[in-house]
């Protein structure tokens, strides 16, 4: 039985040419986490795996830095970047949690971050 | 230049452990990737069978994760397939490779040439 | 694991002509597939990755599309030192799954 639940940043705004820290956490299980996956949309960002470290793709490579953690850094933001953002844990043995972020980019300077909250 | 190449025994015996040797030129095994093993069956299936990491992580595919072990000598550069219990469907021929996980996924780069093995009495 | 279909194992092309090779996952795979080339008593070669991205040194003459969990293989014009047998590959998740090959053989 899937227990876990992961927390995310939510729904959070940023300025164009920033950067933006995503975050998730599982937590409220002993799963042991194998891989996490990094998507937007339907494109993969990252992937961060327990044994083999970090891929980020080649389309996302010059604007996109693994960490803090489990998180990923987007550089460089553009109006382009506004959408959902995905973070895949899979985990043995309960199999696969997903969390989403929404993220918009503005191009004035009132950014702020929405609160967190969970996805079951 | 990395180079890879495999060895072990052409033919194997049902119910017997298959072991095969990848030696590795050009490229510490320690310092960094994931050394792989990889097998292609009569017909030209392919299989994955697992990784063992620059620093001595393994990880197996679950289909043969009973049967399956990876280890290494460091001194000599080389990297080794342990598996037990084997049948004929384990005739195939094997590969090593190596997976840059940084630069292009579970994508592998660099093979040996393969070595045959037949399992039969 | 994730499934790779390859639906044709053969395919007839002419030296010049454009021929592309499919490949549908089972699942979601974003872009995490990779290509390669196995020529006669030979160990495979990785041409393409991340869905489209050509590894070092392969002609520009191979690309990779993807649509969903559609990926496509293309060759624009077809060599005589392109007869062989294409593998994807999705490189998602472990265990890492292929597909069962498509041979490219002249009309």
């Known amino acids: 039985m899937m227990t876990g639940t992961i927390e995310t940043t939510g729904n959070i705004s940023a300025e164009k040419g920033g950067s933006i820290i995503l975050q998730c956490h599982l937590s409220s299980t002993t799963a042991q986490v194998t891989q996490v996956n990094w998507e937007q949309q339907d494109q993969l960002l990252a992937i961060c795996n327990a044994d083999l470290g970090w891929h980020i793709s080649p389309s996302f490579k010059d604007r996109v830095a693994p960490g803090p953690g489990l998180g990923l850094t987007l550089q460089s933001l553009t109006v382009n970047d506004t959408g959902e953002y995905f973070c895949i844990y899979h985990t043995y043995p309960d199999g696969t949690y997903t969390g989403r972020i929404f993220l918009e980019v503005l191009e004035s300077s009132v950014a702020e971050h929405g609160a967190r909250f969970q996805i079951p | 230049d990395v180079q890879l190449q495999e060895s072990g025994p052409g033919l194997v015996k049902p119910s017997q452990s298959l072991s095969l040797t990848c030696t590795v030129t050009?490229?510490?095994?320690?310092?960094?990737?994931?050394w792989i093993w990889i097998r292609q069956f009569p017909g030209n299936k392919v299989e994955w069978m697992g990784y063992?990491?620059?620093?001595?992580?393994?990880s197996y595919n679950p289909s043969l994760k009973s049967r399956i072990s990876f280890t290494r000598d460091t001194s000599k550069n080389q990297f080794f397939l342990q598996l037990t219990s084997v049948t004929t469907e384990d005739t195939a021929t094997y590969y090593c490779?190596?997976?840059?996980?940084?630069?292009?996924?579970?994508?592998?780069?660099?093979w040996g040439q393969g070595t045959s093995v037949t399992v039969s009495s | 694991d994730i499934v790779m279909t390859q639906s044709h194992k053969f395919m007839s092309t002419s030296i010049g002509d454009r021929v592309s090779i499919t490949c549908k996952a089972s699942?979601?795979?974003?872009?995490?597939v990779a290509w390669y080339q196995q020529k006669p008593g030979q160990s495979p070669k990785l041409l393409i990755y991340?869905?489209?991205y050509r590894y070092t040194g392969v002609p520009d003459r191979f690309t990779g599309s993807r649509s969903g969990t559609d990926f496509t293989f293309t060759i624009s014009s077809v060599q005589a030192e392109d007869l062989a047998v294409y593998y994807c590959?999705?490189?998602?998740?472990?265990?890492?799954?292929f597909g069962g090959g498509t041979k490219l053989e002249i009309k």
């Open positions: 490779a190596r997976l840059d996980f940084g630069n292009y996924g579970g994508a592998m780069d660099y």
């Open positions: 050009g490229y510490s095994i320690t310092s960094d990737y994931a």
């Open positions: 063992i990491t620059s620093s001595g992580s393994t």
């Open positions: 699942q979601h795979v974003s872009t995490a």
């Open positions: 991340s869905a489209s």
């Open positions: 590959q999705q490189h998602y998740i472990t265990p890492y799954t």
